[in-house]
């Protein structure tokens, strides 16, 4: 299934192409995949198809969904999938995880950030940088048509860079940001802001009552050895040695593993004999180290069975 | 420019309480650990613990845990540093530092002094 | 948790001198250790990280050496402003521990 993840802010201009390819002279239809309805191509309209691209002028979070695009030709049909999802502006600083466009590493030699997606606005020169939430100053940050380069680069260096650009669409002018993480490599590996692979995010996990049940806490720090990367579990936000409760253990030690070669910990919180009050507490995965602290949530529900008559 | 600002000196009788503040600017204040260091006087320098203000998640070192409590307040970029019953041996210069996957910058100090 | 332990308490040596601060570790901390540059009424500031690289606007002539227990800082040349007080740091685990520190003096 040709189907691609894409995701932006509400009240920001987003641009989403077509994940099946043809000539630019080959015809593309865009729908919504829910109800089949056609998506206009007037650019009056604030949601619009223009050949490959699928504009959000501006986004909102009602626009979440599933999009299908068929690129019609004389001789085929190829249909893909967008699955466009629209969040609410973050009221501090934090990026979550799931706007982050994929980690670039760097080293002293070569220290591009590419602003990601930008290829897709008409966008003009120069864009601003931001790293953790500050604009960059300093003679050390140079911003190049659609990347930047630090000079000299340090370990400090590393973290959430934001560029943030403007899309001009007749006249009309649109803001668009866009996070990625960027490593910093020495010869020893590096370390980076802690990457929770599980739990996702206010995830929710179906449990019998009466069964026991387990849940992994797991957790990427970077490339070769790491330095105060751990990983623990907290029970509305306690931890858990202070929490009362013999049924609910951490597993002593955590397991150290290697995922396509970063270092990642794991460790496990066993419940046993599930009760009803376990599905009333709010389990916390926390990943932290010295760059920082990532905190995933996830909660336990009844799981539902299906009666077939 | 990334700077740490802490509170004055105080001079505090013992069994009273005290809460000393360390205040962050020019960086982003919820994204960086910030850390207590004591230094006692003519001594060395002892790790108290760390807060992480994003998430008001400490750690203290186990010298420590119990004996004073860490805090920050996001809203005004601000950590603290807090006692309920001084004793005289808690006489000592308190550094805060910020910790960007090291103790880059520091806070000027700010002596306790705890004397009847 | 890991002891530091610093060699020797108090060098004391002339400008232009080389300086050679030892730090030893109860246990291998790889090469998680800092070196800081305290002076007296000043805050401590970072000289060196990950046992060798060299902070933001520290001079050349500061260089760190070593991996898991045994580490050194050497001082290439002093100079006036050098004569202070030394400490290492352990960031391998928790808690984070410094050294006791080692006093450099003008002879």
């Known amino acids: 299934k040709f189907s691609k993840q894409s995701w932006g802010l509400e009240n920001e201009a987003l641009i989403v192409r077509c994940p099946r390819q043809g000539k630019s002279s080959y015809i593309v239809d865009w729908y919504y995949s829910q109800t089949n309805k056609s998506i206009p191509t007037q650019e009056r309209n604030r949601v619009f198809a223009s050949g490959q691209l699928l504009k959000f002028l501006p986004a909102e979070v009602a626009d979440s969904g599933i999009y299908t695009c068929i690129v019609r030709s004389p001789t085929f049909n190829r249909t893909g999938y967008a699955n466009v999802t629209i969040y609410k502006k973050q009221p501090d600083c934090n990026v979550p995880d799931y706007l982050m466009y994929s980690t670039v590493s760097g080293s002293e030699k070569n220290s591009k950030i590419y602003c990601p997606t930008i290829d897709l606005y008409n966008w003009t020169a120069p864009l601003e940088w931001f790293k953790n939430c500050q604009a960059l100053q300093g003679s050390r940050y140079k911003a190049h048509k659609s990347f930047l380069v630090i000079d000299n680069v340090m370990t400090d260096d590393a973290g959430d860079y934001t560029c943030k650009f403007i899309h001009n669409e007749n006249g009309a002018n649109y803001s668009v940001t866009a996070t990625r993480s960027f490593t910093v490599k020495d010869e020893q590996g590096f370390s980076l802001f802690p990457v929770i692979r599980a739990p996702a995010h206010n995830e929710t996990k179906e449990v019998e009552i009466g069964e026991n049940t387990n849940l992994t806490c797991s957790a990427c720090f970077g490339k070769g050895a790491q330095f105060l990367a751990t990983v623990q579990w907290q029970l509305n936000g306690n931890k858990i040695t202070d929490f009362s409760e013999p049924r609910i253990q951490q597993e002593e030690g955590q397991n150290q593993s290697f995922s396509n070669g970063l270092a990642c910990v794991n460790t496990v919180l066993r419940i046993a004999d599930v009760k009803e009050e376990d599905l009333l507490l709010r389990y916390d995965c926390l990943a932290l180290n010295l760059h920082g602290l990532r905190r995933h949530t996830i909660r336990l529900s009844r799981k539902h069975h299906h009666h077939h008559h | 420019e990334v700077q740490l600002v802490q509170s004055g000196a105080e001079v505090k009788k013992p069994g009273e309480s005290l809460k000393i503040s360390c205040k962050g600017s020019?960086?982003?204040?919820?994204?960086?650990?910030i850390g207590w260091v004591r230094q006692m006087p003519g001594k060395g320098l002892e790790w108290m613990g760390i807060?992480?203000?994003?998430?008001?998640?400490?750690r203290y070192s186990p010298s420590f845990q119990g004996q004073v409590t860490i805090s920050a307040d996001k809203s005004i970029s601000t950590a603290y540093l807090q006692w309920s019953s001084l004793k005289a041996s808690d006489t000592a210069m308190y550094y805060c530092?910020?910790?960007?996957?090291?103790?880059?910058?520091w806070g000027q100090g700010t002596l306790v002094t705890v004397s009847s | 948790e890991i002891v530091l332990t610093q060699s020797p308490a108090t060098l004391s040596l002339s400008p232009g001198e080389r300086a050679t601060l030892s730090c030893r570790a109860s246990?291998?901390?790889?090469?998680?250790l800092a070196w800081y540059q305290q002076k007296p009424g000043q805050a401590p500031r970072l000289l060196i990280y990950k046992a060798s690289n060299r902070a933001t606007g520290i001079p050349a002539r500061f260089s760190g050496s070593g991996s898991g227990t045994d580490f050194t800082l050497t001082i290439s040349s002093l100079e006036p402003e050098d004569f202070a007080v030394y400490y290492c740091q352990q960031y391998y685990g928790w808690p984070i521990t410094f050294g006791q520190g080692t006093k450099v003096e003008i002879k």
């Open positions: 246990q291998s901390v790889a090469n998680a």
């Open positions: 020019g960086y982003s204040f919820t994204s960086y650990w």
């Open positions: 807060i992480y203000p994003g998430d008001s998640y400490t």
């Open positions: 530092a910020r910790i960007g996957g090291m103790f880059d910058y």
